[in-house]
C-alpha cells in the first residue's frame, strides 16, 4: 500500500491525462482525486499505465467504493480489470 | 530500433542557460514517452522532465519553472531547454524513449521503463 503524503504544490491533478504516466506512486495516491478517477474511468484505458500504477489507482477506487464498483465504472476498466480479484468481482451488481 | 544521441552539455556559470538536443533516429512512430534523466556522481539516475506521444510534460519539483522540455517533429528531435542553471544541477543528462509494451516498473518516472537510451552529455554548473 502506497504511503499517505501530501500532494506536492502544482501536482494535483486537474484531470485525467497521460501527463500521469511519470506520477510516482505515492504521487498518484496523493495528487489524484478518486472522485475525479470514477468520472474520467473512459481516459484510463487510453493511457499507458503501468501495472503498478494501476494498482494505486485501482487502491483509491476501492476506498471511493468499498462496497462494489458502481457500473458507470465497470464499464470502463480496461486493463484495470486485470487487476480485480474474484472477491472484487463479487462485490459488483452488474444488472 | 531507436537510436537516441544527446548533445549541448558543457561548463556554465551558475544562473546561466543551456539547451540540449536528442536526437531519435530509426523510426517514424514517436515513442510513447521521451524523456531526460540526470546522474549525478554516487547517486541515482533521475527523471528530470518526460515528453508523452501526445505533448504533455512532466518536470521533476527540483527544476520546474526553470526547464523546460519540448520538440520538433520535423526534426525528431527533443530538447531540454535549462535556465537559471544551478550548482546542484551538475550531472550528466540522458535522453530515454521509451514504449514499455509490458507495463512494467513503477511508474515513467523510473528508468527501468525506457528501452532507448543516448549516451550521456555532461554539465557542468560552476559555484
Known amino acids: 500500500e502506497v504511503e499517505k503524503t501530501a500532494c506536492p504544490s502544482g501536482k494535483k491533478a486537474p484531470e485525467i491525462d497521460e501527463s500521469l504516466i511519470f506520477y510516482k506512486k505515492w504521487e498518484l495516491e496523493a495528487c489524484v482525486d478518486a472522485a475525479l478517477l470514477a468520472t474520467q474511468m473512459d481516459r484510463v484505458n487510453a493511457i499507458p499505465f503501468t501495472y503498478e500504477q494501476l494498482d494505486v489507482l485501482k487502491h483509491k477506487l476501492d476506498e471511493l467504493y468499498p462496497q462494489g464498483y458502481p457500473e458507470s465504472v465497470i464499464q470502463h476498466l480496461g486493463y484495470l480489470f486485470l487487476k480485480m480479484s474474484p472477491e472484487d468481482i463479487r462485490k459488483w451488481n452488474v444488472t | 530500433e531507436v537510436q537516441v544521441v544527446e548533445s549541448g552539455g558543457g561548463l556554465v556559470q551558475a544562473g546561466a542557460s543551456l539547451r540540449l538536443s536528442c536526437a531519435s533516429s530509426?523510426?517514424?512512430?514517436?515513442?510513447?514517452?521521451m524523456a531526460w534523466f540526470r546522474q549525478a556522481p554516487g547517486k541515482e539516475r533521475e527523471l528530470v522532465a518526460g515528453l508523452t506521444w501526445t505533448g504533455r510534460t512532466y518536470y521533476s519539483d527540483s527544476v520546474k519553472g526553470r526547464f523546460t522540455i519540448s520538440r520538433d517533429n520535423a526534426k525528431n528531435t527533443v530538447y531540454l531547454q535549462m535556465d537559471s542553471l544551478k550548482f546542484e544541477d551538475t550531472a550528466v543528462y540522458f535522453c530515454?524513449?521509451?514504449?514499455?509494451?509490458?507495463?512494467?516498473?513503477?511508474?515513467?518516472?523510473?528508468?527501468?521503463?525506457?528501452?532507448?537510451w543516448g549516451q550521456g552529455t555532461q554539465v557542468t554548473v560552476s559555484s
Open positions: 530509426g523510426r517514424t512512430i514517436s515513442p510513447i514517452a
Open positions: 530515454a524513449a521509451g514504449d514499455n509494451p509490458d507495463r512494467r516498473g513503477s511508474s515513467w518516472s523510473s528508468s527501468s521503463v525506457y528501452e532507448y
